[in-house]
Every structure is written in C-alpha cells, then in structure tokens.
Interface confidence: low
C-alpha cells in the first residue's frame, strides 16, 4: 500500500534569463528511494540514482544543474521553459510517486512586479 505523499514547490514563476530551483519531497513513507527522474512534459531532464548518482540529459547539460538535494536547478531561463515539470520518485517497495510543478517564465518587467503564482 502506497502511503507516501509528494510535496512540491507547486506553481512558481521566474524571470527570463534567471534561474529557478525545482524541489520535491517525499514524506509519510518508509520506502527506499532508488531513483528520482525529472521530466518536462515528455522529455527527460535528469536522473538522480541512489547508487549511480546524477545524470543530466545531454540536450539539457548546459542549462540544468543537479541539486540542491534531489532537486533540480534550471538556468538561463527562456519563455519556452514555461510548462509542467514532474518529479518521479522510484521507490521500493511502494512503487512510483509523481509530483507536478508548473513553471511560468516571465519577461523581466512582469517579474519585477511580483510573481503571478504563490507557492502553496
């Protein structure tokens, strides 16, 4: 039985050209995390594997940095980075938990007047 829950940074906004940290946290389970996948829509961004460590997808190597922790840092943001991001926790024995984050990348002038989204 899957008892865990994923807490995420929820809906967030960031400034074009800046960077953002995507964070998920798995709680309320004693299951062992074997791997965390970070995906954007249908694209794999990065993997953090408990034994093998981090691997960043080659097409994102220049703009994605591992961490902090099991999170992911996106750099040099563009408007095209707007969209859904998923953290997928592979665990044993529970199985797979998925968290969702929506990122909106704003033009500088808009971002300066405050985020449109609040972190819940």
């Amino acid at each position: 039985m899957m008892t865990g829950t994923i807490e995420t940074t929820g809906n967030i906004s960031a400034e074009k050209g800046g960077s953002i940290i995507l964070q998920c946290h798995l709680s309320s389970t004693t299951a062992q995390v074997t791997q965390v996948n970070w995906e954007q829509q249908d694209q794999l961004l990065a993997i953090c594997n408990a034994d093998l460590g981090w691997h960043i997808s080659p097409s994102f190597k220049d703009r994605v940095a591992p961490g902090p922790g099991l999170g992911l840092t996106l750099q040099s943001l563009t408007v095209n980075d707007t969209g859904e991001y998923f953290c997928i926790y592979h665990t044993y024995p529970d199985g797979t938990y998925t968290g969702r984050i929506f990122l909106e990348v704003l033009e500088s002038s808009v971002a300066e007047h405050g985020a449109r989204f609040q972190i819940p």
Epitope: E39, I47, D51, L52
Partner: nanobody, 125 residues
Framework: EVQLVESGGGLVQPGGSLRLSCAAS????????MGWFRQAPGKEREGVSA???????TYSDSVKGRFTISRDNSKNILYLQMNSLRAEDTAVYYC???????????????????WGQGTLVTVSS
Amino acid sequence: EVQLVESGGGLVQPGGSLRLSCAASGYKYGVYSMGWFRQAPGKEREGVSAICSGGRTTYSDSVKGRFTISRDNSKNILYLQMNSLRAEDTAVYYCAARPLWTGDCDLSSSWYKTWGQGTLVTVSS
C-alpha cells in the same frame, strides 16, 4: 560501490559460440538497465545489446539474430550468448549499467554510468 566484472571471453573459430557473463555487485540489480558494448582495435566503442526495464531487449543490426542477451536477477548476472561468430566480432566486450528511466531501451552509451573492465573476444581460424 557498484562493480561489474565480465568473464567468458577467449579465442573461438568463425562460426563458433561463446557466452559472456557479467557479475554485478553493490546494488539492487533489478533497478537498472544493463548493456553490452564492444570496442574493436582502432575503432570506437559501439553498443551491442541491452536489456531494460520490463525485460525489453534491443540489439545492434550487426548482431541481431546471432546474439542473445539475458539476465539472472537471482544471481545478479548478465549474459550475452554469441553464436555464428565472425572475424568482425573480435573486440573487447564491456558490460555496463544504466539507471532505470522512462525512455526507450536504446544503446546510447552516454546513459551508462558504470562499466566493467572488459573481456577480450577473438574470432580467428
């Protein structure tokens, strides 16, 4: 620490068979996809075969129908059964481990993070 140790290489005549083994230690084997790669003298390393999550397999065109990849999860061993060997199969064969993920079962070596030391296969009369 994850370790991969290959064995089973050697000298074989054209048309002959060999079975390579790769003993894996230091992690929960079922979490990973595993692959065999080879590097012939003076050539770049190339993918041979992989066995991925759910038991899916893939083979390079040059070995399809001749080689069979399999694994024994209870013993943490990966196998490559090589039949109808040709001179062009001569190479050092490497076992490699890659993280499980939701993508295709492919032979892109950039995804493989852990490598064995290799075992030499020589096909010659």
